[in-house]
């Protein structure tokens, strides 16, 4: 056997046709190398490892109780260049690469404080913006809108993470915008608000609404305006959270765990690192025997639907696949 050069972060199998596997797969309790060398000379059970046995359920084709995948034909479990179409946000959230963040509009009318709590419950906060480009991304999204109804215009007004603090009441109200919640990153602040005479009597703090103007004829997709409103008013709102690993079943995956990313390829297996799939490897599936025309199952690795008129409908070539 020629000397094997695996990439950094990979384990070199001692023998067999599989030569390199991701390093975290070593000593995880599930043999991957054909000669099982990845599970030899491992620490005794119970010793801490950064990627322990509890993580393996998330790995496609290596579930408990089933046979581990067999590998043929190709020497190395192929690393995959990760592409941006793979999900980094749960369903209903919109991903923006520029800030590595996910955004979601909630149309349920809530006051500012309830809206903030709702965002916190989904591991986010009311959105603030660090750049003009980020704001423009948000404005360009086609957020799900309800059927046109009473208050239709107001559906496009969203609580966001700023407050206007009144500092003086001379000829008119004077104040300044502030980020509403500590810990928000560097942000730009909204323009000065207009104050309605009816709302300017007692409140010393107003809350920010971003109004998006999506209209069929609009060429200017970032047409918008800002409002300082009474925080007790009910409004739709915009939450923002850090991007996260999301698996093919739309489950959020924690740091360090294995998963099959949301996207086009159910045969990918990756490690979640800082919200990004890393060290991805792909299984190669054999063509189903005795079937000329077939379609891949979008959710299951190495499962095929035979489209031949006389063919049996379901094939599973995982056993002759390769990771």
């Amino acid at each position: 056997r020629p000397e094997l050069r695996c990439n950094p972060g990979q384990f070199a199998c001692h023998g067999g046709t599989i030569q390199c596997i991701p390093l975290p797969w070593q000593c995880d309790g599930w043999p991957t190398c054909e000669d099982k060398s990845d599970e030899a000379d491992c620490p005794v059970t119970g010793e801490a490892r950064p990627y322990g046995k509890e993580t393996v359920d998330l790995r496609q084709g290596r579930a408990r109780g089933g046979d581990p995948t067999h590998f043929h034909t190709v020497n190395v479990a192929q690393p995959v260049r990760f592409s941006s179409f793979l999900g980094k946000c749960p369903s209903g959230w919109h991903h923006y690469e520029g800030t590595a963040s996910c955004y979601r509009v909630y149309l349920s009318g809530e006051n500012y404080w309830d809206a903030a709590q709702t965002c916190q419950r989904v591991n986010g906060s009311l959105a603030t913006f660090s750049t003009d480009q980020e704001l423009r991304f948000v404005l360009a999204q086609e957020w799900d809108q309800p059927e046109r109804s009473f208050g239709w215009k107001d559906q496009r007004k969203l609580w966001v993470g700023y407050q206007y603090v009144i500092t003086g009441r001379n000829h008119s109200l004077e104040g300044r915008w502030e980020v509403a919640f500590k810990g928000s990153p560097e942000v730009f602040l909204p323009p000065d608000p207009i104050f309605a005479s009816a709302m300017s009597e007692n409140d010393n703090v107003f809350c920010a609404q971003l109004q998006c103007f999506h209209f069929p004829t609009l060429r200017h997709h970032d047409l918008h305006s800002w409002h300082a409103e009474s925080c007790s008013e009910k409004s739709s709102f915009l939450c923002k959270r850090s991007q996260t690993c999301v698996d093919i079943k739309d489950n959020v995956v924690d740091e360090g765990f294995y998963f099959t990313p949301k996207g086009d390829d159910p045969c990918l297996s990756c490690t979640c690192h800082r919200g990004e799939p890393e060290m991805c490897v792909a299984a190669l599936c054999e063509r189903p025997q005795g079937c000329q025309q077939y379609r891949k199952d979008p959710k299951e690795c190495c499962k095929f639907m035979c489209l031949d008129p006389d063919g049996s409908s379901l094939f599973d070539s995982m056993a002759s696949g390769m990771r």
């Epitope: 909204p190 323009p191 109004q211 209209f215 200017h220 918008h224």
Partner: antibody, heavy 115, light 107 residues
């Protein structure tokens, strides 16, 4: 108190150029959306251009490619560079704070394009 | 581009109520602002977001907007309300003004 003061208007020949200025006080130009709106003699109001706090700029079709809006944050001022002027650009030019609603206006400066 | 249509002129007696209309296709779907402009002066915002009155604008000014028509109503009109009034909204222009209504207070 918010104040906007325009200057730079005057008589110019067709095809000529002019630069209008708007000095702001009582608020910060760079953190607001600032627009130019014009009014031809005896006519109604016409929006000309806007600059967002983030720097994005937009123009009415009638001036696109000829006019340029800009600002000087240090001077807290707004500008409108007008090139290739036409007779139909004759108007009082107002600088205004805002974008979808204009809450403060300057007193205006008259631009006359005539040979 | 949206076209906002206003009556060119209206007259009203002092202390009466006058309504200035502004019509445009599906105007109720967009927010409308109203401006007052007295001769030789700059425009001044009197209503924004259909029905909101900025600080300092008298209570006699009110607004509404639904269907294809926005209205500015001045209750108990005073001589000082004599001016031109413009409605304004946004469209792909993206900002559009009505042609203006000259309000004359009689007497």
């Amino acid at each position: 108190e918010v104040q906007l003061v325009e200057s730079g208007g005057g008589l110019v020949q067709p095809g000529g150029s002019l630069r209008l200025s708007c000095a702001a006080s009582g608020f910060t130009v760079s953190s607001n959306y600032m627009s130019w709106v014009r009014q031809a003699p005896g006519k109604g109001l016409e929006w000309v251009s806007v600059i967002y706090s983030g720097g994005s700029t937009y123009y009415a079709d009638s001036v696109k490619g000829r006019f340029t809006i800009s600002r000087d944050n240090a001077k807290n001022s707004l500008y409108l560079q007008m090139n290739s002027l036409r007779a139909e650009d004759t108007a009082v030019y107002y600088c205004a704070r805002g974008w979808t609603t204009f809450d403060y206006w300057g007193q205006g400066t008259l631009v006359t394009v005539s040979s | 581009q949206a076209v906002l249509t206003q009556p060119p002129s209206l007259s009203v007696s002092p202390r009466q109520t006058v309504t200035i209309t502004c019509s445009g296709d599906q105007l109720g779907d967009r927010y409308v602002s109203w401006y007052q402009q007295k001769p030789g002066q700059s425009p001044m915002l009197v209503i924004y977001q259909d029905d909101r009155r900025p600080s300092g604008v008298p209570e006699r000014f009110s607004g509404s907007n639904s269907g294809n028509t926005a209205t500015l109503t001045i209750g108990g009109t005073q001589a000082m309300d004599q001016a031109d009034y413009y409605c304004q909204t946004w469209d792909n222009s993206p900002v559009v003004f009505g042609g203006g209504t000259k309000l004359t207070v009689l007497g």
